[in-house]
């Protein structure tokens, strides 16, 4: 029961996490204009992985996609790639984990197969979560670097005519969504891996044996099986002392040539 609960909870947590990763990837507010020490402006700028937006004080917003692919910064391309890999792995993991759920019965799927599938999906969720966290962290690092670079530029070139002052950008909502979602996917993956251990069946290689009190007459059986184990027939056809033990199949006695004497 605990295994089913752990697996189910892991699935739900991962599902929420992957939905969050998708949401974060699609969101426009990865970086937002830093309004601290900024001139009073009627417009507000923010950017996502796919497009840039400008919002007017009235609320009207205009966005434009990054149409060029080659002209984009390598870091942005890397973040895009990490997020997409995270989504793809997460989606495959979800698909695998649906069939792995203990509460869902599909044909005559054995527990060992479900355990393997649970472990596979768990690993996929962990990698997916790590990809999302890495992608968001790379972008955040890029923002921090640019923030301090533009801050430094504010004090350069004061003697000259042109002051190369740049707008500073800070963390957008998408970064926090991405971090939380990546963490949830990671936790869900760990839970799936824990559930896998409970699903894996114990190896049992023994037959059920019923014991009968042995009588005074001791029977010798040609080509008999060792009653204590479920392995290996007596290929050399040696007579084995049965000791009164019979497997369920051997309860019925078979006639021998001595019975007709």
């Amino acid at each position: 029961m605990a295994v089913t609960a752990c697996q189910g909870l892991g699935f739900v947590v991962s599902l929420i996490g992957i939905a969050g990763i998708i949401a974060a990837t699609c969101m426009d507010q990865w970086s937002t204009q830093d309004l601290y020490n900024n001139p009073v402006t009627a417009v507000f700028n923010y950017q996502g992985l796919w497009r840039s937006c400008v919002r007017e004080s009235s609320g009207f917003t205009e966005c434009r996609g990054y149409f060029t692919l080659l002209g984009l910064p390598a870091m942005l391309q890397a973040v895009r790639a990490l997020m997409i890999v995270g989504i793809v792995l997460g989606a495959i993991g979800l698909l695998v984990s649906i069939f792995a759920l203990k509460c869902i019965r599909i044909g005559s799927m054995e527990d060992s197969a479900k355990a393997n599938m649970t472990l596979t999906s768990g690993i996929m969720f962990i990698v997916s979560g790590l990809c999302a966290i890495a992608g968001v962290s790379v972008f955040a690092n890029m923002l921090v670097t640019n923030f301090w670079m533009s801050t430094a530029n504010m004090y350069t070139g004061m003697g000259g005519m042109v002051q190369t002052v740049q707008t500073r950008y800070t963390f957008g909502a998408a970064l926090f969504v991405g971090w939380v979602a990546g963490g949830l996917t990671l936790i869900g993956g760990v839970m799936m891996c824990i559930a896998c251990r409970g699903l894996a069946p114990e190896e049992t290689n023994y037959k059920a044996v019923s014991y009968h009190a042995s009588g005074h007459s001791v029977a010798y059986k040609p080509g008999g099986f060792k009653a204590s184990t479920g392995f290996g027939s007596n290929t050399k056809n040696k007579k084995i002392y049965d000791g009164g033990a019979r497997t369920e199949d051997e309860v019925q006695s078979y006639p021998s040539k001595h019975d007709y004497v």
Epitope: T41, V43, F60, R64, T164, V165, T167
Partner: nanobody, 123 residues
């Protein structure tokens, strides 16, 4: 890389009007936010106005609000600055600038610049 060429500058009387044009060489003109800056003799670069990709959002400096109008024609790859009720303090070299992602008042955000056109206002 987009190349910008300004035109329309000249000498005008106080209270008069001028229309500045900025033609872009790049066919991807519509993917740039455009801005106008000016530099008066012995002064720093001052932002005048800006316009988004399709012209949906326009922003103006307080000193020119109500007198200047920015517009763009993406079919002609051109941005315009209509200047009315000109004052002597409007005399400067006017620069056209382009940037791909943000409508800001800071010169450092603009990647591409024109060579400028002189506007003189006589009293």
């Amino acid at each position: 890389q987009v190349q910008l060429v300004e035109s329309g500058g000249g000498l005008v009387q106080t209270g008069g009007s001028l229309r500045l044009s900025c033609a872009a060489s790049d066919s991807t003109f519509s993917s740039y936010i455009m801005g106008w800056f000016r530099q008066a003799p012995g002064k720093g670069l001052e932002w005048v106005a800006g316009i988004t990709w399709s012209g949906g959002i326009k922003d103006y400096a307080d000193s020119v609000k109500g007198r200047f109008t920015i517009a763009r024609d993406n079919a002609k790859n051109t941005v315009y600055l209509q200047m009315n009720s000109l004052k002597p303090e409007d005399a400067a070299i006017y620069y056209c600038a382009a940037n791909a992602i943000q409508l800001t008042r800071r010169s450092g955000d603009y990647a591409y610049w024109g060579q400028g056109t002189q506007v003189t206002v006589s009293s």
